[in-house]
């Protein structure tokens, strides 16, 4: 009886400690998209709508601020659509790209994490076109560390909750 | 004040060339795209082509393709559309209109035209 | 390509009426739908973009409404200075106008 008691005590241990465990999936805010044709920062996002969800860490001004030091596994996905009914490409050759950034406020500092894209030709005879990016990393984070998203030509991001998203969960303790 | 002026009216022989100009003020010529649009009598709107002012690339309708030219001149703040091989049909008012999507703000030209030329009417007769 | 079809070509209503005018696509453009005013010897003015969105300026008794292929203009109490010809666009094609007159 006495182990019963123990092993019921050690999974509700470890399931209040993975509980416990960080993560955010956070989808882009499709209202609230800035513009620009050069890098600009993504700072709407949806945290607990749809597909979007938040646990133990946090979502303010635009950035992921971890809460627990540890090891994270970042991901980040960027669709870039254009649709002939919006109007025509200004210009049809296009730097589609993403940055994953870590801003630092005790040492004040910011680094580039991942970036992924590509040079594009959008020819204007086309109908549609479409490009997807996705990046990950596996990353040590510090508790008031934050993550935001930069891309290029915001104007030609895909609204949809399954198209333009990042996210973050922690995977181990810093040992 | 937004405002964009267009040169006076003119008259042409079939098989002649026209070219018309479109002075922009009151804003950043560089950061928008012109449209030229012409209406003959007792016709519908037609669109003729666009300009991106920046970086000058263009784009036109099918139908005129091959004898329209359009070019911009930005330290005048000034486009040109020129039109050349003129028939009857081509007897029209023709407008530039400014696109409404600054280039600034993303790179899509939307098609609104937010800002009209007062228009030139081009006869063409022999 | 796309074709837009504007009804009625021509109307004809009393200052205070409601006037309604109905622009076709002959297939679906979203909300990528304009609307505008010309005037004989006037430039031409933008009054509804993004099928419903009121330009700057332009009085609030005209609106825009719908989506897909089938959209309306409706000027809510009809003006003396309301009388022009209407256009439908979306991207490189106009609709073929239709003129409001007074009776």
């Known amino acids: 009886e006495k182990a019963m008691v123990d092993g019921s005590w050690l999974d509700l241990a470890k399931r209040s400690k993975l509980e416990a465990q960080p993560f955010a999936h956070l989808t882009i805010n499709a209202t609230d998209i800035p513009s620009g044709s050069h890098k600009v920062s993504l700072s709407s996002w949806y945290h607990d709508r749809g597909w979007a969800k938040i646990s133990n860490m946090t979502f303010s001004n635009g950035k992921l601020i971890v809460n627990q030091d540890g090891f994270y596994y970042l991901y980040a996905n960027i669709c870039f659509r254009h649709h002939e009914t919006s109007g025509d490409l200004a210009t049809e050759y296009l730097q589609l790209m993403v940055y994953v950034t870590k801003t630092s406020i005790k040492i004040p500092s910011s680094h580039t994490l991942m970036k992924g894209g590509s040079t594009k030709y959008w020819s204007g005879n086309s109908e549609f076109h479409f490009y997807s990016i996705n990046v990950g990393g596996f990353f040590k984070l510090r508790s008031g560390e934050e993550i935001s998203i930069e891309v290029s030509n915001p104007s030609l991001l895909d609204p949809d909750q399954d198209a333009t998203y990042f996210g973050a969960f922690k995977v181990r303790d810093i040992d | 004040q937004v405002q964009l002026v267009q040169s006076g009216a003119e008259v042409r022989k079939p098989g002649a060339s026209v070219k018309v100009s479109c002075k922009a003020s009151?804003?950043?010529?560089?950061?928008?795209?012109i449209h030229w649009v012409r209406q003959a009598p007792g016709q519908r709107l037609e669109w003729m082509g666009w300009i991106n002012a920046g970086n000058g690339n263009t784009k036109f309708s099918q139908k005129f393709q091959g004898r329209i030219t359009v070019t911009r001149d930005t330290a005048a703040s000034t486009a040109y559309m020129e039109l050349r091989s003129l028939r009857s049909e081509d007897t029209a008012v023709y407008y530039c209109?400014?696109?409404?999507?600054?280039?600034?703000?993303?790179?899509?030209?939307?098609?609104?035209?937010?800002?009209w030329g007062q228009g030139t009417l081009v006869t063409v007769s022999s | 390509e796309i074709v837009m079809t504007q009804s009625p070509s021509s109307l004809s209503a009393s200052v205070g009426d409601r006037v309604t005018i109905t622009c076709r696509a002959s297939?679906?453009?979203?909300?990528?739908l304009n609307w505008y005013q010309l005037k004989p010897g006037k430039a031409p003015r933008l009054l509804i973009y993004g099928a419903s969105s009121l330009q700057s300026g332009v009085p609030s008794r005209f609106s825009g409404s719908g989506s897909g292929a089938e959209f309306t203009l409706t000027i809510s109490s009809l003006q003396p200075e309301d009388i022009a010809t209407y256009y439908c666009q979306h991207t490189r094609a106009f609709g073929q106008g239709t003129k409001v007159e007074i009776k």
């Open positions: 009151g804003y950043d010529f560089s950061n928008y795209a």
């Open positions: 297939q679906s453009i979203s909300r990528y």
């Open positions: 209109a400014r696109d409404s999507s600054a280039m600034v703000r993303g790179i899509i030209i939307a098609y609104y035209f937010d800002y």
